[in-house]
Interface confidence: medium
């Protein structure tokens, strides 16, 4: 029995619902009483949802899954996963048994956009050209891990003396803190870009130092 799933990962934002597509080709005269359908986590074999003996056996996965009962008879064995979490990321296997047996695995990629970075400066007063300052760029609650880039006001990348740390919170979302140590020129703008590689999302933050006083651009 040929079971079909999408080749590409299904991408879902944290908090939204995802449909893990799975289909088979029922023969003429097929009855749901003949169908055994199991969704399980590919790696751990944990049961997620099942259909057997003509009945939806329900969710075994935090009550966040559902089948499409009206479409099962047409060969649509897709699974709806509600309120997606980071922990849901991974491979799900769809097993279909009528007389023959077939299975296929579909990958779920979870994503969350990063917040607009906040910028802090240490020290933040009495700054003079030649002083060494530490600029921190912080962006929150994204997934997966971000790529962080720094540049000066002319768009020249700043790669030296950058330290970036990413910490996952209890939901598995990452908070990113990137620290740039730089020797001040007469004045200058320093920008950080936090990129979500899955969503191709760019979040920008910048700080402008103009001798005294120092100004932060207003939030757009």
């Amino acid at each position: 029995l040929e079971v079909q799933v999408p080749e590409d990962p299904v991408v879902a934002l944290v908090g939204t619902d995802a449909t893990l597509c799975c289909s088979f080709s029922p023969e003429p005269g097929f009855s749901l009483a003949q169908l055994n359908l199991i969704w399980q986590l590919t790696d751990t074999k944990q049961l997620v949802h099942s259909f057997a003996e003509g009945q939806d056996q329900g969710s075994a996965y935090a009550n966040r899954t559902a089948l499409f009962p009206d479409l099962l008879a047409q060969g649509n064995a897709s699974l709806r996963l509600q309120r997606v979490r980071v922990a849901d990321e991974g491979s799900f296997t769809c097993f279909v048994s009528i007389r023959d047996f077939g299975s296929a695995a579909v990958s779920l990629q979870v994503a969350a956009p990063y917040s607009k970075p906040s910028m802090t400066l240490e020290p933040n007063k009495d700054l003079r050209p030649g002083d060494t300052v530490t600029i921190t760029c912080s962006s929150y609650r994204g997934y997966p891990e971000a790529e962080v880039f720094w540049q000066d006001g002319q768009g020249v990348p700043l790669t030296g003396n950058v330290t970036t740390s990413q910490m996952a919170n209890e939901q598995g979302l990452f908070d990113v803190h990137s620290v740039l140590r730089v020797v001040l020129g007469a004045n200058g703008t320093y920008s950080c870009l936090v990129r979500n590689p899955v969503l191709q999302q760019d979040a920008h933050g910048s700080v402008t130092i103009t001798g005294q006083p120092m100004t932060f651009p207003p939030e757009a």
Epitope: P6, E7, A111, A112, K116, A203
Partner: antibody
Framework: EVQLVQSGAEVKKPGESLKISCKAS????????IGWVRQMPGKGLEWMGI????????RYSPSFQGQVTISADKSISTAYLQWSSLKASDTAMYYC?????????????WGQGTLVTVSS | EIVMTQSPATLSVSPGERATLSCKAS??????LAWYQQKPGQAPRLLIY???TRATGIPARFSGSGSGTEFTLTISSLQSEDFAVYYC?????????FGQGTKLEIK
């Protein structure tokens, strides 16, 4: 360069069927979502639905579910929007637009629009 | 479905001045919010996505902000070519609904 070229304007009678097209070029057709947006005369944009040509998976707005069918032909990099029985209220400009290679993306590139007029 | 509400319906601003357009979502959409510009007889054009990321080729005078349910599009110094209709769209969850539009007109 990404381009979406739509078929020409159509004038139809109520009850007739219609299939309009959107020919894509400049990118890998099978790996990006492509969708349709309606704009009735003098009104705003309405999201109708999208399709992933790679596997044919689609999503519809509840307002358009069962009213239209979105399909795609990978072999000629073309997406379609079709009606089996047109109504006067289907008179509108229809735009095709390409999203990203993941579903949660806005519409980056737009076709020039196809004007559909349904009148007896 | 998520309902998007834009305000004001019409905004009259003089060239060179700043324009601020608002968009509200009926429930949280994180930062999955896009802005489009449409001129008469033309297809819409993507300006901003992920609430604040400018699309390729969009001038720096266009900026977006917001998260959750409230979003803003700001045009810092209006040029003659900026007078058009602007739509917001949530791209958080299907159906990806649009707001009803804000017409930006010359004062």
């Amino acid at each position: 360069e990404v381009q979406l070229v739509q078929s020409g304007a159509e004038v139809k009678k109520p009850g007739e069927s219609l299939k309009i097209s959107c020919k894509a070029s400049g990118y890998t057709f099978t790996t990006y979502w492509i969708g349709w947006v309606r704009q009735m005369p003098g009104k705003g944009l309405e999201w109708m639905g999208i399709i992933y040509p790679g596997d044919g998976g689609s999503r519809y707005s509840p307002s358009f579910q069962g009213q239209v069918t979105i399909s795609a032909d990978k072999s000629i990099s073309t997406a379609y929007l079709q009606w089996s029985s047109l109504k006067a209220s289907d008179t509108a400009m229809y735009y095709c637009a390409r999203g990203g290679n993941y579903i949660s993306f806005p519409m980056y590139y737009w076709g020039q629009g196809t004007l559909v007029t349904v009148s007896s | 479905e998520i309902v998007m509400t834009q305000s004001p319906a019409t905004l009259s601003v003089s060239p060179g001045e700043r324009a601020t357009l608002s968009c509200k979502a009926s429930r949280g959409v994180s930062t999955a919010l896009a802005w489009y510009q449409q001129k008469p007889g033309q297809a819409p054009r993507l300006l901003i996505y992920w609430a604040s990321t400018r699309a390729t080729g969009i001038p720096a005078r266009f900026s977006g902000s917001g998260s959750g349910t409230e979003f803003t599009l700001t045009i810092s110094s209006l040029q003659s070519e900026d007078f058009a209709v602007y739509y917001c769209q949530q791209h958080y969850d299907t159906p990806y609904t649009f707001g009803q539009g804000t017409k930006l007109e010359i004062k």
